[in-house]
């Protein structure tokens, strides 16, 4: 999906008012310095592409993030503020239903959510120069 035509300000507002705290709660008990940010993004569409990938695509050691509350809210926000997003995701969701995983918080998942926090922070500050 091409995130270029999303309403970025509305997505930012959604993140600040309904998503960010759930990411913090997921990470509770973890030191903020525990993980290094290794995933970066250069602009808002790129950030959303990376956020979508990390949130919804199962990875080795962390297969369950898509069933977390912050993921559900991310899915809802993208569907509302990115034209055509919901249509492109219907087939992907049917495939995901077949391999629905139990929610498990692993160290790998914590690291992945830490990366997500960094991507969201970057998304919210699009005018900053890339480090």
């Amino acid at each position: 999906y091409d995130f270029t035509n999303c309403d970025f300000e509305k997505i930012k507002a959604a993140y600040l008012s309904t998503i960010s705290k759930d990411l913090i709660t997921y990470m509770s008990g973890t030191k903020s310095t525990e993980f290094n940010n290794t995933v970066s993004c250069s602009n808002r569409p790129h950030c959303l592409t990376e956020i979508q990938s990390l949130t919804f695509n199962p990875t080795a050691g962390c297969a369950s993030l898509a069933k977390e509350m912050f993921a559900m809210k991310t899915k809802a926000a993208l569907a509302i503020w990115c034209p055509g997003y919901s249509e492109t995701q219907i087939n992907a969701t049917q495939a995901m239903k077949k391999r629905r995983k139990r929610k498990v918080t692993t160290n790998k998942c914590l690291e992945q959510v830490s990366q997500l926090q960094g991507l969201w922070r970057r998304f919210n500050r699009p005018l900053l120069k890339q480090q």
Partner: antibody
Framework: QVQLVESGGGLVQPGGSLRLSCAAS????????MSWVRQAPGKGLEWVSG???????YYADSVKGRFTISRDNSKNTLYLQMNSLRAEDTAVYYC???????????WGQGTLVTVSS | DIELTQPPSVSVAPGQTARISCGGD??????VYWYQQKPGQAPVLVIY???KRPSGIPERFSGSNSGNTATLTISGTQAEDEADYYC???????????FGGGTKLTVL
């Protein structure tokens, strides 16, 4: 303007079935998570069920296995099929648009379901 | 699912400040929403994301949330504010929406 209009409520005997409908207008229905919330006479609000644009569904424990939520995005309509109805299912049923999955920003006017012999 | 606890009733004199509490385990780690419901009407969202007001909701409505308690504050309460108020959050395991039992606000 944004509107949700419920229909299908009425009197039904215990063990019976009923299907509620909710016609949505004024917004892109297919993009939103939609849900049903009920309110028994003189009591508080109880979330019943919800569904995403892709058909994935969620239910309260009190209705799991008896109620089925569905949607027709081409008709901008949300449904609630209620089977094996009990007296405790008597309530006003509200159709609701759930913003960002976790809260309701638009409510219908409600339709009354009465389960009694 | 988590349980949200509200006082059944709160009374306030016109022009005074009304505070309605909502208690729940580690509630501060989740977002809280508040709805106003008048007799015979559907609920209306008055606070979202702990403390934000939807457009059209008067400034006298405000919210806060920390620890195990969220609070809806109505400053300079008016007769038209008399209604039932419900807090709402969600369960992080089941993902279900959860409502408090409701508080009847009486403006004396």
């Amino acid at each position: 303007q944004v509107q949700l209009v419920e229909s299908g409520g009425g009197l039904v005997q215990p063990g019976g079935s009923l299907r509620l409908s909710c016609a949505a207008s004024g917004f892109t229905f297919s993009s939103y998570y939609m849900s049903w919330v009920r309110q028994a006479p003189g009591k508080g609000l109880e979330w019943v069920s919800g569904t995403f644009f892709d058909g994935s569904t969620y239910y309260a424990d009190s209705v799991k296995g008896r109620f089925t939520i569905s949607r027709d995005n081409s008709k901008n309509t949300l449904y609630l099929q209620m089977n094996s109805l009990r007296a405790e299912d008597t309530a006003v049923y509200y159709c609701a648009r759930q913003q960002y999955f976790d809260h309701i920003d638009i409510w219908g006017q409600g339709t009354l379901v009465t389960v009694s012999s | 699912d988590i349980e949200l606890t509200q006082p059944p009733s709160v009374s306030v004199a016109p022009g005074q400040t009304a505070r309605i509490s909502c208690g729940g385990d580690s509630l501060g780690g989740k977002y809280v929403y508040w709805y106003q419901q008048k007799p015979g009407q559907a609920p209306v969202l008055v606070i979202y994301g702990d403390s934000k007001r939807p457009s059209g909701i008067p400034e006298r409505f405000s919210g806060s949330n920390s620890g195990n308690t969220a609070t809806l504050t109505i400053s300079g309460t008016q007769a038209e504010d008399e209604a039932d108020y419900y807090c709402q959050s969600y369960d992080l395991k089941s993902l279900n929406v959860v409502f408090g039992g409701g508080t009847k606000l009486t403006v004396l």
